[in-house]
């Protein structure tokens, strides 16, 4: 009664700096609350970027400062990170918890790595 | 860094009631899982209770369900574990711990021992 | 409920010598992780998802196996590594933990 997180190996960021991945989980119960979190890896280290709670069927909700965005489609959750940089190239791995009822489980994917280029300065026009 | 300071254990009758505290510093507490874990004198590991971020989700031991309940208060960055109606076999190390981002417990504390006896 | 049986429950070796534990789950686990306990200190994270190792554990620990047997191995046994170790199952509640095997002087 394992979950199994599944997110794709490898997404390009656009030239505003907005990346999005579908992190989709294979639930062992029938949860009717779940967090997802967004975990980066750089290194060995292990930073929380961004996490929402909801309610099965209702939309994700992050803090307000959040520089995540996302929706929800059954076992599906699109998510969307904004204002990324160069220097957040990285492995971003996605984490599901299977809130309520119990029993709780967790399940992590294995990452997707986010290719992120700075947009070249614009030539100035004389 | 990172510390997990227990506090609050001590000698009560059988029956009685104990309340402890684990005052956590160096993380932003509320961002974490956190859980109680025991260990019987010259025994091992038995995890207790565990409670979620802002405080809802809350999961126990089937040996101290409705017993024990574990609660926080993420201003304080304090965890708490209410102890009633203790048992001779309730005798342990307390002992919180941090739940990491990838699950495992990263951090524990150094624990405070309680003794239940007549 | 998930149970973790460690054998064996203690192992006798040498400094400088392979050290060998076992760990085996009732169903199939997910995410297992390896503790270390010295005598009046609180436990230390070795080893999570099975093989990964935690910050600042040397590489002479290592871990390994999948589903229902997991193994921990310390390559040479420095004399800090004699203590008590214990297996962690952490995918779904209740967390459960091995008995332990202590990993004693000869």
């Known amino acids: 009664k394992a979950m199994h997180v599944a997110q794709p190996a490898v997404v390009l960021a656009n030239s505003r700096g907005t990346a999005s991945f579908v992190c989709e989980y294979a639930s062992p119960g029938k949860a009717t609350e779940v967090r997802v979190t967004v975990l980066r890896q750089a290194d060995s280290q292990v930073t929380e970027v961004c996490a929402a709670t909801y309610m099965m069927g209702n939309e994700l909700t992050f803090l307000d400062d959040s520089i995540c965005t996302g929706t929800s489609s059954g076992n599906q959750v699109n998510l969307t990170i904004q204002g990324l940089r160069a220097m957040d190239t990285g492995l971003y791995i996605c984490k599901v918890e299977l809130m309520y009822p119990p029993p709780y489980y967790m399940g992590i994917g294995n990452g997707t790595q986010i290719y992120v280029i700075d947009p070249e300065p614009c030539p100035d026009s004389d | 860094q990172v510390q997990l300071v227990e506090s609050g254990g001590g000698v009560v009758q059988p029956g009685r009631s104990l309340r402890l505290s684990c005052a956590a510093s160096?993380?932003?507490?509320?961002?974490?899982?956190m859980h109680w874990v025991r260990q019987a004198p010259g025994k091992g590991l038995e995890w207790v209770a565990v409670i979620w971020y802002d405080g809802r989700n809350k999961y126990y031991a089937d040996s101290v369900k409705g017993r024990f309940t574990i609660s926080r208060d993420n201003s304080k960055n304090t965890l708490y574990l209410q102890m009633n109606s203790l048992r001779a076999e309730d005798t342990a190390l307390y002992s919180c711990?941090?739940?990491?981002?990838?699950?495992?417990?990263?951090?524990w504390g150094q624990g405070t021992l309680v003794t239940v006896s007549s | 409920e998930i149970v973790l049986t460690q054998s064996p429950g203690t192992l006798s070796l040498s400094p400088g010598e392979r050290a060998t534990l076992s760990c085996r789950a009732s169903q199939s686990v997910s995410y297992l992780a390896w503790y270390q306990q010295k005598p009046g200190q609180a436990p230390r994270l070795l080893i999570y998802g099975a093989s990964s190792r935690a910050t600042g554990i040397p590489d002479r620990f290592s871990g390994s196996g999948s589903g229902t047997d997991f193994t921990l191995t310390i390559s040479r046994l420095e004399p800090e590594d004699f203590a008590v170790y214990y297996c962690q199952q952490y995918g779904s509640s209740p967390w459960t933990f091995g008995q332990g095997t202590k990993v004693e002087i000869k």
């Open positions: 160096g993380f932003t507490f509320s961002r974490y899982g």
């Open positions: 711990a941090r739940a990491g981002e990838l699950g495992p417990f990263d951090y």
